[in-house]
C-alpha cells in the first residue's frame, strides 16, 4: 500500500491520543535503554510503511502483535485516515481474527513494539519538520 | 441478537436542541463506526457524521459542523447524536447505523429510525 | 459535497432485469472504489444490498449485482420479484471528511 496520500496530521492526533498509551501499557516494566532501535525511516509514508510491516506482519519470534489494543487502532487509524487502506488489508483482517489468543508477551515482541515507538517517534519528528 | 436500538420520537420547538440515543447490542460496539443518517419526510438520505469509539475519532459532515455532536459510551454500548439551533427543515427520521470494521462507510446494521418534529 | 444524480424513478415486468444508475464525480465515485447501495421498503430502514462496488452481504440475493465504470454506479436487478419493489439509493464515500453522500433515491416498480 502507498502511504502517500494519507492525512499524516490526524494520523499524528490518534497516534498522540491513543495509540502512544497503548504502545507505553504493552512495554510498561521495560526500560528505554533495553532495546537498540534498528529500524528506521525517512519520510511519513515510509515510515508507516516500516509501522504497517512490524505491527502486521508476523514474525519467526513474534507472531502474535497484530491482536494487540494498539494495533486494532492502529489498524482503525490508517483504514479512517489512508483512502483505499483497508481494500488492501481484508486478508490481514481475517488472519487477524483467526490469530490465538494466547497472551505471552515475548522478550523478542517487547523488542519490536520497542521498534514501533521509535518509528513512531520518528513519524512525528518527520512531520513538525514540514510544518 | 445484533442490533441497534434507538430512542423514541422527540417534539422539539425552533432553536432548541435534540439529543437520539442509539444503544449496540451483539457485538463488540467499540470496534465499528456508528454513523448518523437522516431522512425528512418524502426525502432522499443525508450522511450527518460517524464515531469510531475504538479510537475516539468523531467526523461530521460539512453540513452540520457546529451544529451536530456525536458521542458515544463505550461501558453501555451507546451512541448519542445532539443537534443544536434546529429548525422545520430538521424534521427527519434520525437513523443510526453500523459501519463496517475498518470500512466504515458501508452501514450494514441499521436502528430503527428516530421521528424528530420541530415545530412552533 | 452535492447529491450523486439517480433516476427518480425504474420498472420493470416479474421476471426482467432492470439497471438503475447513479452519477457522480472524480471525487466520489470515480475516485474510489467504495460504493454501496441501500434497498428501502416504505416506513423501514435502510437495507445494506451491495458494497465495495459490487460485493453482495450474506442474506443478499445474488439477482442483485453492482458494477462502475468512470464516475458512473450501476445497480442491475435480474429476474424482478414483486418484493424488490422499493427505493434503492446509491452511496460513495468521498473522502477522509466525508464518509457517505447519497443519490436522490430511485422508486423501483414491478409492474
Known amino acids: 500500500y502507498d502511504f502517500t496520500n494519507c492525512d499524516f496530521q490526524k494520523i499524528e492526533a490518534d497516534y498522540l491520543r491513543t495509540i502512544s498509551k497503548d504502545l507505553i501499557t504493552y512495554m510498561s516494566g521495560t526500560k528505554s535503554t533495553d532495546f537498540n532501535n534498528t529500524v528506521s525511516c525517512s519520510n511519513r509514508p515510509h515510515c508507516l510503511t516500516e509501522i504497517q510491516s512490524l505491527t502486521f506482519n508476523p514474525t519467526p519470534r513474534c507472531a502474535s502483535l497484530a491482536k494487540e489494543m494498539f494495533a486494532r487502532k492502529t489498524k482503525a487509524t490508517l483504514a479512517l485516515w489512508c483512502p483505499g487502506y483497508s481494500e488492501t488489508q481484508i486478508n490481514a483482517t481475517q488472519a487477524m481474527k483467526k490469530a490465538r489468543k494466547s497472551k505471552v508477551t515475548t522478550n523478542k515482541c517487547l523488542e519490536q513494539v520497542s521498534q514501533l515507538l521509535g518509528l513512531w517517534r520518528r513519524f512525528i519528528r518527520t512531520l513538525l519538520k514540514k510544518q | 441478537q445484533v442490533q441497534l436500538v434507538q430512542s423514541g420520537a422527540e417534539v422539539k420547538k425552533p432553536g432548541s436542541s435534540v439529543k437520539v440515543s442509539c444503544k449496540a447490542s451483539?457485538?463488540?460496539?467499540?470496534?465499528?463506526?456508528i454513523n448518523w443518517v437522516r431522512q425528512a419526510p418524502g426525502q432522499g438520505l443525508e450522511w450527518l457524521g460517524v464515531?469510531?469509539?475504538?479510537?475516539?475519532?468523531?467526523i461530521y459532515a460539512e453540513k452540520f459542523q457546529g451544529r451536530v455532536t456525536i458521542t458515544a459510551d463505550t461501558s453501555t454500548s451507546t451512541a448519542y447524536m445532539e443537534l443544536s439551533s434546529l429548525r422545520s427543515e430538521d424534521t427527519a427520521v434520525y437513523y443510526c447505523?453500523?459501519?463496517?470494521?475498518?470500512?466504515?462507510?458501508?452501514?450494514?446494521?441499521w436502528g430503527q429510525g428516530t421521528l424528530v418534529t420541530v415545530s412552533s | 459535497q452535492s447529491a450523486l444524480t439517480q433516476p427518480p424513478s425504474a420498472s420493470g415486468s416479474p421476471g426482467q432485469s432492470v439497471t438503475i444508475s447513479c452519477t457522480g464525480t472524480?471525487?466520489?465515485?470515480?475516485?474510489?472504489?467504495?460504493v454501496s447501495w441501500y434497498q428501502q421498503h416504505p416506513g423501514k430502514a435502510p437495507k445494506l444490498m451491495i458494497y465495495?462496488?459490487?460485493k453482495r452481504p450474506s442474506g443478499v440475493p445474488d439477482r442483485f449485482s453492482g458494477s462502475k465504470s468512470g464516475n458512473t454506479a450501476s445497480l442491475t436487478v435480474s429476474g424482478l420479484q414483486a418484493e424488490d419493489e422499493a427505493d434503492y439509493y446509491c452511496?460513495?464515500?468521498?473522502?477522509?471528511?466525508?464518509?457517505?453522500?447519497f443519490g436522490g433515491g430511485t422508486k423501483l416498480t414491478v409492474l
Open positions: 452511496s460513495s464515500y468521498a473522502g477522509t471528511d466525508t464518509f457517505a453522500i
Open positions: 447505523a453500523r459501519g463496517q470494521e475498518y470500512f466504515y462507510w458501508y452501514f450494514d446494521l
Open positions: 472524480t471525487s466520489d465515485i470515480g475516485g474510489y472504489n467504495r
Open positions: 465495495e462496488v459490487s
Open positions: 451483539g457485538f463488540t460496539f467499540g470496534s465499528y463506526g
Open positions: 464515531i469510531v469509539p475504538l479510537v475516539g475519532v468523531t
